[in-house]
């Protein structure tokens, strides 16, 4: 669609174009089982444009449906380590707050590899915290081309 | 300037326990996974365990699986490898190593080492 | 788990000249994810090279780690007395991460 002249005079933030994508930063502790994020120009290729950081934790400032998409690459791996152990060792995505909107995204599961990645179109809304949940005794790359977490406004 | 102090090896009897620790300096010791990694004299060496930079996820190799518990203090910028129902096999030197930024386990930095010999 | 195996034993060389190194993997090393350490008497290991090629801080330019999939090489071009030691490699790209059992260069 073509844009007015008022349009184009409009940073991107103001036409709803939310955009953000983040670098791993750490795990949590013990019986923590999120990933904590980070993101800016001074950390390299990751930013928030319009979403923000809530200790480490992804929220929602504009109403509309995202794409939402994750890569996680793992780096203590092996195909036994990513199928043997009795905890489920998945990775999932969902919105943890607030709790009247929680609800599971995305659902992965590493089964014999190292790397996961996924992405959907899913609606949220203002104030939404999305969280991201590794289960099992594995731990993340941090490396900025293997392990990464973004969502994109695509429309209202 | 990175350092790795390790303390706590020494002479113990088979069956018994003991307990390492690994002092860090120089870096922000919670923002890196660490391991311990051990050497049996004239032998090649062996990963034994690592530990997140949170302190929340551990790893062990199958030859220490249920014996050995890696822990950390924050805190205190300290490592620990408490050793239970040890053998003579566990006889080694015992490295603490930190991990890469990326959390792979490769070791940038080491610890001199303490000598744990288990025997009767 | 994968095992490593590194040639030769031993390697008699003179101060100048060029030491070659292998490590072979018992199976391909995911995105070749290997380390070479160095160590000398009485001293904890010494990274070298990582992901096979790229020099850790600090390490001179003499030193270089080339190959892929299963078989890997350190070059030390023009050896310095200081670096007649036991070189080892280890492998990060599957758990359990392993060594090989090391190659000593010492002076010929």
């Known amino acids: 669609q073509r844009l007015s002249r008022a349009q184009q005079q409009l940073p991107l933030e103001s036409l709803g174009w939310d955009i953000a994508e983040l670098q791993l930063n750490h795990t949590g502790p013990q019986q923590d089982p999120r990933l904590y994020w980070q993101g800016g120009p001074a950390l390299g290729r990751s930013f928030l444009r319009g979403p923000e950081l809530d200790k480490g934790q992804l929220r929602i400032r504009r109403d509309g449906i995202y794409m939402v998409h994750i890569q996680v690459t793992l780096a203590i791996c092996s195909s036994t380590s990513t199928s043997r152990h009795h905890h489920p060792t998945t990775l999932a995505v969902g919105i943890c707050s607030p709790a009247s909107r929680s609800i599971s995204l995305l659902r992965l599961s590493f089964h014999q590899g190292c790397t996961i990645a996924s992405q959907r179109l899913t609606p949220l809304a203002r104030g939404d915290t999305l969280c991201t949940n590794l289960t099992g005794t594995l731990l993340p790359s941090r490396n900025t081309d293997e392990t990464f977490f973004g969502v994109q406004w695509v429309r209202p | 300037e990175v350092q790795l102090l390790e303390s706590g090896g020494g002479v113990v009897q088979p069956g018994r326990s003991l307990r390492l620790s690994c002092a860090a300096s120089?870096?922000?010791?919670?923002?890196?996974?660490m391991s311990w990694v051990r050497q049996a004299p004239g032998k090649c060496l062996e990963w034994v365990s690592a530990i997140s930079g949170s302190g929340g996820r551990t790893f062990y190799a199958e030859s220490v699986e249920g014996r050995f518990t890696i822990s950390r203090d924050n805190s205190k910028n300290t490592l620990y490898l408490q050793m239970n129902s040890l053998r003579a096999e566990d006889t080694a030197v015992y490295y603490c190593?930190?991990?890469?930024?990326?959390?792979?386990?490769?070791?940038?930095?080491w610890g001199q080492g303490t000598l744990v010999t288990v025997s009767s | 788990e994968i095992v490593l195996t590194q040639s030769p034993g031993t390697l008699s060389l003179s101060p100048g000249e060029r030491a070659t190194l292998s490590c072979r993997a018992s199976?391909?090393?995911?995105?070749?994810?290997l380390a070479w350490y160095q160590q000398k008497p009485g001293q904890a290991p010494r990274l070298l090279i990582y992901g096979a090629s790229s020099r850790a801080t600090g390490i001179p330019d003499r030193f270089s780690g080339s190959g892929s999939g299963t078989d890997f090489t350190l070059t030390i071009n023009r050896l310095e007395p200081e670096d007649f030691a036991v070189y080892y490699c280890q492998q990060y790209g599957s758990s359990p991460p392993t060594f090989g059992c090391g190659t000593k260069v010492d002076i010929k």
């Open positions: 120089g870096f922000t010791f919670s923002s890196y996974a």
């Open positions: 190593a930190k991990h890469d930024y990326s959390n792979y386990p490769y070791f940038d930095y």
């Open positions: 199976q391909s090393v995911r995105s070749n994810y």
